[in-house]
Interface confidence: medium
């Protein structure tokens, strides 16, 4: 492979490897690898492996999150599970004869143990294991609200399945809200979608650990598969650094246009179709703020400079641990235009025309 | 601003301006600006301006679409509006006394005039103007299906509003499905969310052009504000080029790992924590496919080379019309890891660790 100069493929790989070294340590806010002296012998505990697999499954089933990454999102997230209050608890008594819904209760003190502060929560998912089913059903999820009302959260069209399958609902906002309140019991309701004219509103979906017991649906295995919250949160000790360390800024128009930033930033550029391009044929708009990205993204050698100060720079200058980080557009917006073809005016939308923010990538 | 060499700010701007020149022409598949000889004098027709404003509103209310851009999405989209079948049409008779829903009928031959081929459709939005309202209501949208059944499409929680506001629903899949069928009348239903235990399932939302007439809700103004489909589609003549011209490839692992591409592509790189980093402290996984981006993204001078062949290169090598395009990650995936802190095993998720595809940006 060659650009202007011949590229030393091995050197690029080495730089990438060393960048990844710094990236991982930096994401974990570690100045050096943790000591291994106290690690117990033997394989990993089953619960830890199960949690790891839950997280890996989530990765496999999702595309990359494309939103500009807030500072806190750059850092690693600790993953924990909070199981639903046991079905034998008296709290479930009133709900057992309701055919259109199943109820899941959670103890917020269990959640608070995993996530001591609401802002630390990065993501919360409600995970339910649906048993095999031959029917299609449209289901809904609700959150228990004050004075016995229910707030709609989302829905899913469940198609027939030959094997049990995990359902996942993003309940980050709900859990963050619970953490902002006092401790207590909170609830979700999983219901059949009730149509205005339909008579049969029975929930035909069976959820492992809630629906009538089946053989083998007991003990630890049953416990692993009963509804739970999968939580991803910034550990408290890491969060304290977030407040004290130099903030990673969004390299957007708000920041860049009002600063004298020398490094990578979005730069202002207005294109006047007539003056800049000598074009009269675009009738609307007369011009637009195209903007562009410019400024260095220094490559940080982590090999012989493993200091907190240097690691903190990764977040801003090389978050992707690139062998040669580059200042490129992050958020782009489309541009609608009006022009004529003969006598016929046309409205067309041009994608990715306006640079709103940049990033080192 | 300076990197290694001093950057000539004016030259960068000039290069960006000239890149935009080529980009716009390329997006419209024009070898040169269209002739203005036949343009009628006077202001733009009102309907064209209204359509332009609808498109601009859509841009303002949305963030940039972050998905990797398919080849067709690079090119300009023609924007058209298809109004709902007039309320005086006998087809509405049966629906007038239903309190929980309002119905909107569309003639697919009107849609086909704007979008002759299903694959040309890029986006279809159902736009409804909601009149001012003092109530909060949870509403749902359905599509008419064969044998008089309705398919759920989506929902919205509508809060009280002092002014009329536009609601927009993405109905791209539905409209593409209609275009795959024979012509005829198709319908949407906009309904109150009916709860399993609630008695009042009346729709309290009023939609302009459907709900009982109000003063000033007549003539052209009424017509502009009655429910419509906003369609974005690749014009037929532009689509024929898509089939014949050199395809823009996704620079992902599927393509890059099996080709000898010299230009920008994702390059294979497996990191073995132990061998490459000398680390034993990460227990799971043992390593991961980090990958990296490498290869030139040639800058294309459009100033003195306005030929179809050159313009076609923009799509692959400089789709963002950058002054210095750069090969960077497009799709990234997180990596969950297991490690110990003292005796305590931790599961953490590291964001944006795996490069799945690259792009010139």
């Amino acid at each position: 492979l060659s650009t202007c100069k011949t590229i030393d493929m091995e050197l690029v790989k080495r730089k990438r490897i060393e960048a990844i070294r710094g990236q991982i340590l930096s994401k974990l806010r570690l100045a050096s690898p943790p000591s291994q002296g106290e690690v117990p012998p033997g394989p990993l505990p089953e619960a830890v492996l199960a949690l790891y697999n839950s997280t890996r499954d989530r990765v496999a089933g999702e595309s990359a999150d494309p939103e500009p990454e807030p500072e806190a999102d750059y850092y690693a997230k600790e993953v924990t599970r909070v199981l639903m209050v046991d079905r034998n608890n008296a709290i479930y008594e009133k709900t057992k004869d309701i055919s259109h819904s199943i109820y899941m209760f959670f103890n917020t003190s269990d959640i608070r143990e995993a996530v001591p502060e609401p802002p630390l929560l990065s993501r919360a998912e409600l995970r339910l294991q649906r048993l095999k089913s031959s029917v299609e059903q449209h289901v809904e999820l609700y959150q228990k609200y004050s004075n016995n009302s229910w707030r709609y959260l989302g829905n899913r069209l469940l198609t027939p399945t030959d094997t049990p399958e995990w359902l996942s609902f993003d309940v980050t906002g709900v859990v963050r809200q619970w953490l902002n309140q006092g401790d207590g019991i909170q609830a979700f309701r999983f219901s059949a979608h009730c149509s205005c004219d339909s008579k049969d509103n029975k929930l035909h979906v069976e959820i492992n650990g809630i629906s009538p017991k089946r053989r083998g649906d007991l003990g630890t295995i049953h416990d692993m598969n009963r509804p739970f919250l999968l939580l991803m949160a910034t550990p408290l000790e890491r969060a304290q650094h977030l407040h004290s360390s130099r903030h990673r800024r969004a390299l957007d128009t708000n920041y860049c246009f009002s600063s004298t930033e020398k490094n990578c930033c979005v730069r202002q550029l207005y294109i006047d179709f007539r003056k800049d391009l000598g074009w009269k044929w675009i009738h609307e708009p007369k011009g637009y703020h195209a903007n562009f990205c410019l400024g260095p993204c220094p490559y940080i050698w982590s090999l012989d400079t493993q200091y907190s100060k240097v690691l903190a720079l990764y977040n801003q200058h090389n978050p992707g641990a690139s062998a040669s980080p580059c200042c490129v557009p992050q958020a782009l917006e489309p541009l609608p235009i009006v022009y004529y073809v003969g006598r016929k005016p046309k409205v067309e939308q041009l994608s990715n025309m306006i640079v709103r923010s940049c990033k080192c990538s | 601003l300076s990197t290694c060499k001093t950057i000539d700010m004016e030259l960068v701007k000039r290069k960006r301006i000239e890149a935009i020149r080529g980009q716009i022409l390329s997006k419209l598949r024009l070898a040169s600006p269209p002739s203005q000889g036949e343009v009628p004098p006077g202001p733009l027709p009102e309907a064209v301006l209204a359509l332009y404003n609808s498109t601009r509103d859509r841009v303002a209310g949305e963030s940039a679409d972050p998905e990797p851009e398919p080849e067709a999405d690079y090119y300009a989209k023609e924007v058209t509006r298809v109004l709902m079948v007039d309320r005086n049409n006998a087809i509405y008779e049966k629906t007038k006394d239903i309190s929980h829903s309002i119905y909107m009928f569309f003639n697919t031959s009107d849609i086909r005039e704007a979008v002759p081929e299903p694959p040309l459709l890029s986006r279809a939005e159902l736009r409804l103007q909601r009149l001012k309202s003092s109530v909060e209501q949870h509403v749902e949208l359905y599509q008419k299906y064969s044998n008089n059944s309705w398919r759920y499409l989506g929902n919205r929680l509508l809060t009280p509003t002092d002014t009329p506001e536009w609601l927009s629903f993405d109905v791209t899949g539905v409209v593409r499905q209609w275009l795959n069928q024979g012509d005829g009348i198709q319908a949407f239903r906009f309904s109150a969310h009916c709860s399993c235990d609630s008695k009042d399932n009346k729709l309290h939302v009023e939609i302009n052009g459907i709900s009982p007439k109000r003063r000033g809700d007549l003539g052209t103004i009424h017509d502009m504000n009655r429910p419509f489909l906003l369609l974005m589609a690749t014009p037929l003549e532009r689509a024929q080029h898509l089939h014949s011209s050199r395809h823009r490839r996704a620079l992902d692992t599927n393509y890059c790992f099996s080709s000898t591409e010299k230009n920008c592509c994702v390059r294979q790189l497996y990191i073995d924590f132990r061998k490459d980093l000398g680390w034993k402290w990460i227990h799971e996984p043992k390593g991961y496919h980090a990958n990296f981006c490498l290869g030139p993204c040639p800058y294309i001078w459009s100033l003195d080379t306005q030929y179809s062949k050159v313009l076609a290169l923009y799509n692959q090598h400089n789709p963002g019309a950058s002054a210095s395009p750069c090969c960077v990650p497009q799709a990234l995936e997180p990596l969950p890891i297991v490690y110990y802190v003292g005796r305590k095993p931790k599961v953490e998720q590291l964001s944006n660790m795996i490069v799945r595809s690259c792009k010139c940006s």
Epitope: - | S109, R112, P116, E117, G182, D183, Q186
Partner: antibody, heavy 120, light 112 residues
């Protein structure tokens, strides 16, 4: 005047192939969807396949799916039907028909038909 | 069996009014899809008579009219003439079939 003229029919053995053509004139061929419809001896009409104006979308009846391929050359104003793996039940008069508007599935112009006989 | 049902034969005397019916379902006629009527004279190709259920094709005499209600479509010929002796087919797109388009079995109209 709109004209559609089919050709390419004939006698073929089971398992054999034939390619039918339909030459169009008197209208802007590239603006309309076109269909093949067949009629077995003494029987009713049966829709076979459809190709859209630009040739991007194609649809086939279940009875011919995987065996027949419809294509068009808008430069030559010609429609084609490549028929492979022919069976005795494919014996029929094959008509090409033009859509009234775009792809309305309403056939306002028909060819005179071409006879296809599949027999050993 | 055809998805669209037509009587296989009908007859009428010159000057009379005859109505040929075509019964479908909510996935074709009742689904709002465009319904057409075709006339096929002996030994010739079919010809479009009615499109979109009730619109006469150009050059079709106004003795021919079409209507539709629910899952039923009708073709009415008033003032029957000898040259109207032919096979009549209804046709419609069907959303429940992968085939897409369907014709009725055809009605053989004899003018006595």
């Amino acid at each position: 005047e709109v004209q559609l003229v089919e050709s390419g029919g004939g006698l073929v053995q089971p398992g054999g192939s034939l390619r039918l053509s339909c030459a169009a004139s008197g209208f802007t061929f590239s603006n309309y969807g076109v269909h093949w419809v067949r009629q077995a001896p003494g029987k009713g009409l049966e829709w076979v396949s459809h190709i859209s104006a630009a040739g991007i979308s194609r649809y086939y009846a279940d009875a011919v799916k995987g065996r027949f391929t419809m294509s068009r050359d808008n430069g030559k104003n010609t429609l084609y039907l490549q028929m492979n793996g022919l069976k005795s039940e494919d014996t029929a008069v094959y008509y090409c028909a033009k859509d009234r508007i775009r792809s309305s599935y309403e056939y306002d112009s028909w060819g005179q038909g071409t006879q296809v006989t599949v027999s050993s | 069996l055809p998805v669209l049902t037509q009587l296989s034969s009908m007859s009428g005397s010159p000057g009379q009014t005859v109505t040929i019916t075509c019964t479908g379902s909510s996935s074709n006629i009742g689904g709002g899809y465009y319904l057409s009527w075709y006339q096929q004279l002996p030994g010739t190709a079919p010809k479009l008579l009615i499109y979109n259920a009730n619109n006469r094709a150009s050059g079709v005499p106004n003795r021919f009219s079409g209507s539709k209600s629910g899952n039923l479509a009708s073709l009415t010929i008033t003032g029957l003439q000898a040259e109207d002796e032919a096979d009549y087919y209804c046709g419609c797109y069907d959303s429940s079939l992968s085939t897409g388009y369907v014709f009725g079995g055809g009605t053989k109209l004899t003018v006595l």
